[in-house]
């Protein structure tokens, strides 16, 4: 969480990021909220990116001016327009790619003043896993597979029967490199299982970590799977 | 050059299927928003469906329920798969790129939903 | 849902002339996520302007978009034989993900 405070003369408001990961090829949140003002047409809103000439975005007298905004951002970037009056100036970004990581300014002036905050925004790309029963195999095997991960992550496997214990000599990890030639498909196979047992397939990289759970019985196979991102720190 | 070419349109009877395929080249189909548009005849442009990148899927209300979008990243080819056929979804199928905005679309190739 | 309404639904004008051409949103839509297609009979859309002023590649400056909020405005200021056709204002980013307008058809009076 980085806050930030602006001085105007006297004045300052508190402008508040949340350092945020963007999942490439999917659309992406730079949070930013600020004091909030009861005129619209006081507030301005302006998102900056280091080293990038023109704006990210600008939002002023009630509407987006994307007169000085960089060519990189054209076509890519709203704001919420219906919550800035409460404070919201957080930032959708279409189509995140790998290139859009780097560090972002919220700049805001109000009719109480101005402030801004700076936010570290990362770009990856992660995915859930799905862990199944692999019935080619000769053994009682499980197969764990999530299409879409970059930075390459790490592969571990955990399971509830001996808690604490990784698989490191009983499973293998390989990573394929997707069409587009950035992300990854992540396949993990562990070998040997035993019926009745929960087993968990974590993946894991810089930006985020997904779980995927299997509890093979003789009767049923139940699943559970979970993704959360790992840098969302506040400023 | 950057080019849309679909194909698989034809005449289907009410409650039949048919899947349209959107061939991609001078550009990764996986590295962009990818759309199906459709146009009845002498109407408007309707947006029916979008895959991004991520592989994430959405579908006007129209047709949610019966028809799929996907690709196949390796034929670097977009799909849409039309199931219980009605009427009403006769009309030119456009597939299309979504970057800034739709700047790259196909001909078009034409649903004929009829007894 | 975001609906777009285009007027006029049908715009008369000689070549010379200046066409504008209006979208209205019935609420706010992003300035960034506002494009313009124009199409001819038996062909595809064609891009014109994306972002709601930004002319795509090989558009010429006679065409300009402006507008923000809920008004967007096409203007074509000095029409070609070759401007007549449907003209379509389009939204990303809400539910639906992207809707168009009924469009406007430019006809030579």
């Known amino acids: 969480l980085i806050i930030g405070f602006g001085i105007s003369g006297r004045h300052s408001i508190t402008v508040t990021t949340l350092t945020s990961a963007g999942n490439i090829g999917e659309d992406g949140i730079l949070s930013c909220t600020f004091e909030p003002d009861i005129k619209l047409s006081d507030i301005v809103i302006q998102w900056l990116k280091e080293g990038v000439m023109g704006l990210v975005h600008e939002f002023k007298e009630g509407k987006d001016d994307l007169s000085d905004q960089d060519e990189m951002f054209r076509g890519r970037t709203a704001v919420f327009a219906d919550q800035v009056i409460g404070g919201n100036a957080s930032l959708r970004l279409k189509n995140v790619q790998l290139t859009d990581a780097g560090t972002y300014k919220c700049y805001i002036i109000t009719s109480k003043g101005k402030g801004n905050a700076n936010l570290e925004y990362k770009t990856g790309a992660f995915s859930i896993p799905e862990v199944n029963v692999d019935y080619n195999a000769s053994s009682e095997n499980l197969r764990c597979e999530a299409p879409r991960w970059f930075p390459q992550p790490t592969v571990v496997w955990a399971s509830q029967a001996d808690q604490g214990a990784n698989f490191s000599e009983v499973f293998n990890t390989s990573f394929e490199l997707n069409s587009e030639n950035v992300t990854m498909k992540v396949v993990s196979v562990l070998y040997n299982v035993t019926i009745n047992n929960t087993y968990s397939c974590m993946i894991e990289n810089d930006i985020a970590k997904a779980t995927g759970d299997i509890k093979v019985t003789d009767s049923e196979i139940k699943r559970r799977s979970h993704l959360q991102l790992l840098n969302s720190k506040a400023s | 050059e950057v080019q849309l070419v679909e194909s698989g349109g034809g005449l289907i009877q009410p409650g039949g299927s048919l899947r349209l395929s959107c061939a991609a080249s001078?550009?990764?189909?996986?590295?962009?928003?990818m759309n199906w548009v459709r146009q009845a005849p002498g109407k408007g442009l309707e947006w029916v469906s979008v895959?991004?990148?991520?592989?994430?899927?959405y579908y006007a209300d129209s047709v949610k329920g019966r028809v799929t979008i996907s690709r196949d990243n390796s034929k670097n080819t977009l799909y849409l798969q039309m199931n219980s056929l009605r009427a009403e979804d006769t009309a030119v199928y456009y597939c299309?790129?979504?970057?800034?905005?739709?700047?790259?679309w196909g001909q078009g190739t034409t649903v004929t939903v009829s007894s | 849902e975001i609906v777009l309404t285009q007027s006029p639904g049908t715009l008369s004008l000689s070549p010379g002339e200046r066409a504008t051409l209006s979208c209205r949103a019935s609420q706010s839509v992003s300035s960034s996520y506002l494009a313009w297609y124009q199409q001819k009979p038996g062909q595809a859309p064609r891009l014109l302007i994306y972002?709601?002023?930004s002319r795509a590649t090989g558009i010429p400056d006679r065409f300009s978009g402006s507008g923000s909020g809920t008004d967007f405005t096409l203007t074509i200021s000095r029409l070609e034989p070759e401007d007549f056709a449907v003209y379509y204002c389009?939204?990303?980013?809400?539910?639906?993900?992207?809707?168009f307008g009924q469009g406007t058809k430019l006809e030579i009076k």
């Open positions: 299309a790129r979504d970057t800034y905005a739709m700047d790259v």
């Open positions: 001078g550009f990764t189909v996986s590295s962009n928003y």
């Open positions: 389009q939204q990303y980013g809400s539910s639906p993900m992207y809707t």
């Open positions: 895959i991004y990148g991520s592989g994430r899927t």
């Open positions: 972002g709601a002023s």
